[in-house]
Interface confidence: medium
């Protein structure tokens, strides 16, 4: 049953050439060049993708042809060294190319920038877009795919196919609208939002492969597949691991062709399957293939199995619960998993995998003991705090985010993330908590029942993000600690850090609160970000600051902003009121 | 060692039913996952059915979900499989089989290689 066993084929690159068609074989190839340099000119990767695909034309047509025998990655490789600017634009990356394959290909992976050098995309007039589209309908979409995969070097490859789907159906519906712009830009935006909140799950995915291994990528699957799938067996369960498990690390690891390809199988394979695996899957399987794998990806949870009994009888009652360990340790722990997730989709899927670790923990501490049955009779009961703390923690801030609104909450983590790490820098404090801000509009409209999975799991997508942009340049011993030392407690252990009392207060610099007429051209968003990085900067100064004295100089800050983009001559007001606040705020602050 | 004996099995019309049992001998009865096979002549051993210890939780193969019901009874160390609505294709051998490893039950239900004991089979015939 095993959906990826293939047989061999003389040309890897004829194989997937076939097996994806061509269409999307330039579109993949195009998405893994800007995925690893993600410096180079949108011209220089479609003449590099334009080779690549005329010499897979020439295997399929002849696989014993010279090189076609090749592995992808040393093609793929091979033509990547060819760029005449590698040591001027990337610097020690073109070192990479000394190395053989699998090294270079590795070499390339560490390389790769989750915050590259790249201008904002900023988005034309509606009327330049269409005509664009118009103009040169592949160029422009192509286009989509580079400017998107370079900026995001983990973005999920097949799910971008399906992104850039979308996005050609929006141009191709509202460049014929009476009213463009009213089609096109609320189109724009949800993909826009899709896509980031896209790339930074799977960012997390390829940094539990990546930092934790396969076995904990497969415990975050067994849960979550479980919770979604809970009428499936376990041994259905484990198999749809093993598979994602497959087509997740090849995608993290740059193996677009192959991820894309072993995607698709295992959309079919679930579609042929689904009286085994759930009832919700029928309007998924009836799509097209992009559309499918994104939905069954998306599907909601199958109802749970009626009369599923106590889990007590086989995991804690019965005498052999150490016998069975014994025997396979990880299959063990993978059906308790199973067992836990199918009856807890109102749980989120690291508070479920600290249940597992707990209980893991207590076998292995037990199962040497005299009585084993007598030391984990009551493991269950340690489970209670684990679950309440997660409860109390979305409880309160669901409060505090009603109180407050989205941008005052925001404010509110800014403020105390800024407290628990003032070292980091402003842009990356300010990205995540504006993120962290969001669970509120995200699951606080949820009921009970699905608070937890939606919040906790998001704020580890979101915590990771910190984490990855920390690790390119590391200035904090207690976000290091926090993002390496286990996945599944990261946000607890962010949200039992106190304030770091370390910290020395940064000098206090006129120029970081000096603002200009500029700003009243910004969109209400980008308003909110400067006057969020002004508020991260106060903090860094005063970390002592009162609530109070912070929202004095923020409603100082927010009536001074509005009074100036009011005034005639906007840049006068600007110098001349902005000495006054920040005058007032140091002397509110005591700087 | 856990002997099994099945009992129940004769001749039947389509249509009718039958209720098979498979008693086991041994006091560790209820560790044992159950399982029903059958052999038509000429073909292979296929799976039937299987129920774990507690007897919640149960498989059963495609052709006979709806139509099969497996059940147990660890005071009496007895396996029951009640057949409804038997068709000629349901004639066969059905053997009654006990498996021990906890991991195999979750893994590979549907496997004879998980089971770690046999009994002789009894012979079901339904005429139409």
């Known amino acids: 049953r095993g959906v990826f066993r293939r047989d061999a084929h003389k040309s890897e690159v004829a194989h997937r050439f076939k097996d994806l068609g061509e269409e999307n074989f330039k579109a993949l190839v195009l998405i893994a060049f800007a995925q690893y340099l993600q410096q180079c000119p949108f011209e220089d990767h479609v003449k590099l993708v334009n080779e690549v695909t005329e010499f897979a034309k020439t295997c399929v047509a002849d696989e014993s042809a010279e090189n076609c025998d090749k592995s992808l990655h040393t093609l793929f490789g091979d033509k990547l060294c060819t760029v005449a600017t590698l040591r001027e634009t990337y610097g020690e990356m073109a070192d990479c190319c000394a190395k053989q394959e699998p090294e270079r290909n590795e070499c390339f992976l560490q390389h790769k920038d989750d915050n590259p050098n790249l201008p904002r995309l900023v988005r034309p007039e509606v009327d330049v877009m269409c005509t664009a589209f118009h103009d040169n309908e592949e160029t422009f979409l192509k286009k989509y795919l580079y400017e998107i995969a370079r900026r995001h070097p983990y973005f999920y490859a097949p799910e971008l196919l399906f992104f850039a789907k979308r996005y050609k159906a929006a141009f191709t519906e509202c460049c014929q609208a009476a009213d463009k712009a009213a089609c096109l830009l609320p189109k724009l935006d949800e993909l826009r939002d899709e896509g980031k909140a896209s790339s930074a799950k799977q960012r997390l995915k390829c940094a539990s492969l990546q930092k934790f291994g396969e076995r904990a990528f497969k415990a975050w699957a067994v849960a979550r597949l479980s919770q979604r799938f809970p009428k499936a067996e376990f041994a259905e369960v484990s198999k749809l691991v093993t598979d994602l498990t497959k087509v997740h690390t090849e995608c993290c690891h740059g193996d677009l062709l192959e991820c894309a390809d072993d995607r698709a199988d295992l959309a079919k394979y679930i579609c042929e399957n689904q009286d085994s695996i759930s009832s919700k899957l029928k309007e998924c399987c009836e799509k097209p293939l992009l559309e499918k794998s994104h939905c069954i990806a998306e599907v909601e949870n199958d109802e749970m199995p009626a009369d599923l009994p106590s889990l007590a009888a086989d995991f804690v009652e019965s005498k052999d619960v150490c016998k069975n360990y014994a025997e396979a340790k990880d299959v063990f722990l993978g059906m308790f998993l199973y067992e836990y997730a199918r009856r807890h989709p109102d749980y989120s899927v690291v508070l479920l995998l600290r249940l597992a670790k707990t209980y893991e923990t207590t076998l292995e501490k037990c199962c040497a003991a005299a009585d084993p049955h007598e030391c984990y009779a009551k493991v269950f009961d340690e489970f209670k705090p684990l679950v309440e703390e997660p409860q109390n923690l979305i409880k309160q801030n669901c409060e505090l985010f009603e109180q407050l609104g989205e941008y005052k909450f925001q404010n509110a983590l800014l403020v105390r993330y800024t407290k628990k790490v003032p070292q980091v820098s402003t842009p990356t404090l300010v990205e995540v908590s504006r993120n962290l801000g969001k669970v509120g509009s995200k699951c606080c409209k949820h009921p009970e029942a699905k608070r937890m999975p939606c919040a906790e799991d998001y704020l580890s997508v979101v915590l990771n993000q910190l984490c990855v942009l920390h690790e390119k340049t590391p200035v904090s011993d207690r976000v290091t600690k926090c993002c390496t030392e286990s996945l599944v407690n990261r946000r607890p252990c962010f949200s039992a850090l106190e304030v770091d009392e370390t910290y020395v207060p940064k000098e206090f610099n006129a120029e970081t609160f000096t603002f200009h007429a500029d700003i009243c051209t910004l969109s209400e968003k980008e308003r909110q970000i400067k006057k969020q990085t002004a508020l991260v900067e106060l903090v860094k100064h005063k970390p002592k600051a009162t609530k109070e004295q912070l929202k004095a100089v923020m409603d100082d800050f927010a009536a001074f902003v509005e009074k100036c983009c009011k005034a005639d001559d906007k840049e006068t007001c600007f110098a001349e009121e902005g000495k006054k606040l920040v005058a007032a705020s140091q002397a509110a602050l005591g700087l | 060692e856990v002997q099994l004996v099945e009992s129940g099995g004769g001749l039947v019309h389509a249509g009718g039913s039958l209720r098979l049992s498979c008693a086991a001998s041994?006091?560790?009865?209820?560790?044992?996952?159950m399982g029903w096979f059958r052999q038509a002549p000429g073909k292979e051993r296929e799976f039937v059915a299987a129920?774990?210890?507690?007897?919640?939780?149960?498989y059963y193969s495609d052709s006979v979900k709806g139509q099969f019901t497996i059940s147990r009874d660890n005071a009496k160390n007895t396996v029951y499989l009640q057949m409804n609505s038997l068709k000629p294709e349901d004639t066969a051998v059905y053997y009654c089989?006990?498996?021990?490893?906890?991991?195999?039950?979750?893994?590979?239900?549907?496997?004879?290689?998980?089971?770690?004991?046999w009994g002789q089979g009894t012979q079901v015939t339904v005429s139409s």
């Open positions: 089989a006990a498996g021990g490893t906890f991991s195999n039950w979750y893994t590979r239900p549907r496997s004879g290689d998980s089971y770690d004991h």
């Open positions: 041994g006091p560790t009865f209820s560790n044992y996952f």
């Open positions: 129920v774990k210890w507690s007897g919640y939780h149960t």
